[in-house]
């Protein structure tokens, strides 16, 4: 048992042209939340197939309202991790889907409206208990940066969370064949709970509930000797039933290495040398071939046509490891100049330049308004390495190309009536309210019941909103 943890670092426009429009606006504030779906193995199933490993939903992020004229920034995120508990073993290879959802906070009838902004998916190899793995995924013009890890819940430990730990019984060392539980060196790996009645001397198990026999023993509980000819070199006490010398529990006895792996004793436990096509602590992960798609991040798989021949992954630039699962951090060389943000995309390095700079490494200083056209009579305003369009009345958006319906977002409060006007909008306030948007009750204790406004102020008169 354990928990898969996902930390979202940022969600915003990706580098390059075609920046997405902000999902929120002054008329329609919104907030983001995320959903993660996990499936075991390297499944290429449809997004709708069950999340067999589990799923989780984040909290809602802070309310976000776009600042007119400002470029879409990274959007405010929910606090905390997304956690997906798993009850059984961690599979080691998994597929994920991360969805970014928008919750609109307008005045929709029936509550907030939800819409899917972006969906990213991938397949990864990950050992439980390892460090956080960082990732960047693109969905259209959006970019999602996140980290993930799998960790075991005590008493489980190990790369698959299948080993159990228990407090050390003797102060000096763990029992035969049992390793200390790093990082809990004061605890020892606990033997798995084998099938009830399984001989503690002659049986062992690799999965809870099973009973596998050491060489020379047989039967469902490993209590029946095969024959005296099966006796191993004498290392332990004599067996009363056969006169055969039963081996003591050396870590390699019975060869815990599956699939023809050879066992060698180490000071603390044992080590399996696996034949080609097998891997894992006990060579228990069966032959992976190129057909299984073992190379991540666009790696090219060569060889491995059948389970007896090994495959080799030829990794694209930016990735390494036997399965191209490790990202090379080429951004540590800080190749982007003028404060540019370095993105290692695997196949290439990309610099996301600060406003006012351009070029592959942000080496060119720009005239902010050069070549920038503001439509519909808007004027380009320079400032602080950024450009923005100051739009003529009735137009909005980054380049003043959007003709706004100023009344679409119901901008007049307290029942005020909105009128589109060539210079913006006009709110005609209900009796007892005033302000450009009718947001101020004149007498808040009974505003709607007021027969008249204060002298010289007629609340029913339109109030220009400029």
């Amino acid at each position: 048992a354990g928990v898969f943890e996902l930390q979202i670092h940022s969600f915003g426009p990706g580098p390059g042209p075609g920046a997405p429009r902000s999902p929120c606006s002054a008329r329609l504030p919104c907030r983001l939340f995320f959903r993660v779906c996990l499936k075991p193995g390297l499944s290429e199933e449809a997004a709708e197939s069950p999340c067999a490993l589990g799923a989780a939903l984040s909290a809602r992020g802070p309310v976000y309202t776009e600042q007119p004229g400002a470029p879409a920034p990274d959007l405010p995120l929910p606090d905390g991790l997304l956690q997906v508990p798993f009850r059984d073993a961690w599979p080691g290879t998994f597929s994920f889907i991360i969805e970014t959802w928008r919750e609109e906070l307008g005045d929709q009838i029936g509550g907030p409206a939800w819409s899917l902004l972006a969906r990213v998916a991938g397949r990864r190899r990950l050992a439980a208990g390892g460090p956080w793995a960082r990732d960047i995924q693109r969905a259209g013009a959006w970019e999602l940066r996140f980290s993930y890890r799998a960790r075991c819940e005590p008493p489980a430990v190990g790369t698959a969370c299948t080993r159990l730990c228990r407090p050390r019984s003797a102060p000096s060392r763990c029992g035969p064949g049992l390793r200390p539980c790093a990082p809990l060196e004061d605890e020892c790996e606990a033997p798995l709970v084998c099938r009830a009645g399984c001989s503690p001397e002659h049986g062992f198990c690799e999965q809870p509930g099973e009973c596998r026999c050491l060489e020379g023993w047989t039967g469902p509980l490993c209590t029946v000797p095969v024959s005296t000819s099966s006796c191993l070199s004498p290392r332990g006490p004599s067996s009363a039933t056969t006169g055969c010398l039963v081996p003591g529990p050396g870590p390699c006895d019975g060869n815990p290495c599956a699939n023809g792996g050879s066992c060698s004793e180490t000071p603390r436990s044992f080590e399996c040398t696996c034949p080609r096509g097998f891997y894992g602590l006990r060579c228990e992960v069966s032959g992976v071939t190129c057909a299984d798609g073992p190379c991540f991040n666009g790696g090219l798989c060569v060889g491995g046509a059948d389970p007896d021949s090994a495959y080799i992954c030829h990794c694209p630039p930016g990735f390494q490891g036997s399965n191209c699962e490790k990202r090379v951090d080429r951004c540590s060389l800080q190749p982007c100049r003028n404060g540019g943000l370095c993105l290692d995309l695997g196949h290439a390095l990309r610099c996301r330049c600060r406003a006012g700079f351009a070029g592959p490494r942000c080496e060119h200083d720009l005239d902010d308004c050069a070549g920038r056209a503001c439509a519909n009579g808007g004027t380009c305003v320079e400032g602080g390495g950024a450009h923005r369009c100051s739009c003529a009345l009735g137009f909005g958006g980054r380049d003043c190309r959007e003709r706004a319906d100023p009344c679409a977002a119901r901008p007049c409060a307290h029942g005020g009536r909105c009128y589109a006007h060539f210079s913006g909008l006009v709110c005609a306030c209900a009796p007892g309210y005033m302000g450009a948007r009718c947001e101020f009750p004149v007498h808040p204790d009974g505003a709607s019941a007021l027969p008249a406004a204060p002298p010289g102020l007629r609340p029913g008169d339109p109030q220009r909103y400029l």
Partner: nanobody, 117 residues
């Protein structure tokens, strides 16, 4: 949740000046429509001045030309500069905020202004 805390009230002579401050937390004042209200003993609470999210202002006639409402986004505060104070301006002055994203209203606890010789 928006919290509002008023300060700056006190005793002042007729014709004198006073500036009230309202510090907001929980939201940026640039996204809020803010106002000052007052309630004199035995009377209903009434609007004095308001500043909309877009910066436009509104005043009741009896304070026009004497009172000025302003906003400082950096300090997340709203102010009411009161000049040429009169005895009839004596009241508890309350800060008010209207949050557009939720269409909810918020009130401060109030600060007492006494205009007396």
């Amino acid at each position: 949740e928006v919290q509002l805390v008023e300060s700056g009230g006190g005793l002042v002579q007729p014709g004198g000046s006073l500036t009230l401050s309202c510090a907001a937390s929980g939201s940026s004042v640039s996204f809020l429509s803010m106002a000052w209200y007052r309630q004199a003993p035995g009377k209903k609470r009434e609007l004095v001045a308001g500043i909309s999210a877009d910066g436009s202002t509104a005043y009741i006639d009896s304070v026009k030309g004497r009172f000025t409402i302003s906003r400082d986004n950096a300090k997340n505060s709203v102010y009411l500069q009161m000049n040429s104070l009169r005895a009839e301006d004596t009241a508890v002055y309350y800060c008010y905020a209207y949050r557009w994203t939720t269409r909810r209203t918020y009130w401060g606890q109030g600060t007492l202004v006494t205009v007396s010789s």
